[in-house]
């Protein structure tokens, strides 16, 4: 019960997440005009990773798309791929996830191949999470060097009569949607790889001792009281519920969880 | 058509109040950031406030600050200019104006009179 | 606050002449954000409220004749009118739309000789 709410919570918040990288990825608020100790203007400007926009105190926004590849800053580049990435990886992450679920019943898909699977997004969570918080942070560590090296040449002018004012730039919305939904998507991805260490078969570096008896045979396993009976069809490798407990034939056929640690 | 109309200029004494009013229609009001324009004797043109279209934002040179106070009531497709403690200055003909494209004043009203006299 | 400073304070011109007007604001209104000019011309004649001509510095109001260019960046603007009409005698003004206060300059009076 305790696995299943884990990857379902896993599930939920890495879904809100990515839900978050997205909205992120396509707000225009990465970066927006500096209001502190500036001249009060009649026109707010904001950039986002795909253009830029102008808010006149009248109420008009104008907002133009970045049309050239070639001529943008490699940084910002670096940072649109991180996103994308982080994107992609979150989508397939979910997909895979969605299968992975416990509560979910495709065909006769074994636990330990859930576990593979919970295992799967769970890293895939992590890396979308930690590339997302890399772009978000690269982008604010160029706003930082842009602010404080514009701040040191804002007025410039001849005479002594100030004839520029430079615009400064500082954190926009998305910055904080990004750190905040890149950490709930690293949050999602451990949580499924908790749920995964739940969902795979317990096994031991020992191998499991077959003791036949009279009319029966009996399949022991180390560290536990739980076995499966030799008769009829239950011969072959067929799964017990309570506990996770799996034949000596079936606990081979499937990699342990110490495999992916 | 857009129509901007003034009421509520007249004659009064220094430090007195007036409230003046502007009546907007032929547009959506609601979405658009207004002004009071004044024009003194002298023909000089001064922004005396300017209200944002949500209300959030109103602007006042230092001469006004603090006596001067800009409102709307979008129900009523109203402006509002509150004036108080009034000086000769303060004469001049108040115009209700819209802001458009570039922040340009693109309707005016055709201005009311303030005479600020002992 | 920013000033507008307009030169000449007054044009006396004669009609079909080619007429310029200058303005120059004390700091920049270059918007850095969409490389826009905020300055703004109105035209007033006697008895009437202003007239918006043109906006962006640049850019001429609907209904506005072609006579009619705005020009300028930064902080030096000037206003042309390629043919004067008698109906375009009137009082320009040129106004800061880019720092708050949004200041207006003198005016240049434009009469007929």
């Known amino acids: 019960m305790a696995v299943t709410a884990c990857q379902g919570l896993g599930f939920v918040v890495s879904l809100i997440g990515i839900a978050g990288i997205i909205a992120a990825t396509c707000m225009d608020q990465w970066s927006t005009q500096d209001l502190y100790n500036n001249p009060v203007t009649a026109v707010f400007n904001y950039q986002g990773l795909w253009r830029s926009c102008v808010r006149e105190s009248s109420g008009f926004t104008e907002c133009r798309g970045y049309f050239t590849l070639l001529g943008l800053p490699a940084m910002l580049q670096a940072v649109r791929a991180l996103m994308i990435v982080g994107i992609v990886l979150g989508a397939i992450g979910l997909l895979v996830s969605i299968f992975a679920l416990k509560c979910i019943r495709i065909g006769s898909m074994e636990d330990s191949a859930k576990a593979n699977m919970t295992l799967t997004s769970g890293i895939m969570f992590i890396v979308s999470g930690l590339c997302a918080i890399a772009g978000v942070s690269v982008f604010a560590n160029m706003l930082v060097t842009n602010f404080w090296m514009s701040t040191a040449n804002m007025y410039t002018g001849m005479g002594g009569m100030v004839q520029t004012v430079q615009t400064r730039y500082t954190f926009g919305a998305a910055l904080f949607v990004g750190w905040v939904a890149g950490g709930l998507t690293l949050i999602g991805g451990v949580m499924m790889c908790i749920a995964c260490r739940g969902l795979a078969p317990e096994e031991t570096n020992y191998k499991a001792v077959s003791y036949h008896a009279s009319g029966h045979s009996v399949a022991y396993k180390p560290g536990g009281f739980k076995a499966s009976t030799g008769f009829g069809s239950n011969t072959k490798n067929k799964k017990i519920y309570d506990g996770g407990a799996r034949t000596e034939d079936e606990v081979q056929s499937y990699p342990s969880k110490h495999d992916y640690v | 058509e857009v129509m901007l109309v003034e009421s509520g200029g007249g004659l009064v004494k220094p430090g007195g109040s007036l409230k003046l009013s502007c009546a907007a229609s032929g547009f959506s009001f609601s979405n658009s950031a207004m002004s009071w324009v004044r024009q003194t004797p002298e023909k000089r043109l001064e922004g005396v406030a300017t209200i944002s279209s949500g209300d959030s934002y109103t602007y006042y040179p230092d001469s006004v600050k603090g006596r001067f106070t800009i409102s709307r009531d979008n129900a009523k497709n109203s402006l509002y200019l509150q004036m108080s403690s009034l000086r000769s200055e303060d004469t001049a003909v108040y115009y209700c104006?819209?802001?458009?494209?570039?922040?340009?004043?693109?309707?005016w009203g055709q201005g009311t009179s303030v005479t600020v006299s002992s | 606050d920013i000033v507008m400073t307009q030169s000449p304070s007054s044009l006396t011109v004669t009609a079909g002449e080619k007429v310029t007007m200058s303005c120059k604001s004390s700091q920049s209104l270059l918007n850095s954000g969409n490389q826009k000019n905020y300055l703004t011309w109105y035209q007033q004649k006697p008895g009437q409220p202003p007239k918006l001509l043109i906006y962006w510095s640049s850019t001429r109001e609907s209904g506005v004749p072609d006579r009619f260019t705005g020009s300028g960046s930064g902080t030096d603007f000037t206003l042309t009118i390629s043919s004067v009409q008698a109906e375009d005698l009137a009082v320009y003004y040129c106004?800061?739309?880019?720092?708050?206060?949004?200041?207006f300059g003198a005016g240049t009076k434009l009469e007929l000789k």
């Open positions: 106004q800061n739309d880019y720092y708050y206060p949004l200041t």
């Open positions: 104006a819209r802001q458009g494209y570039g922040n340009a004043l693109d309707y």
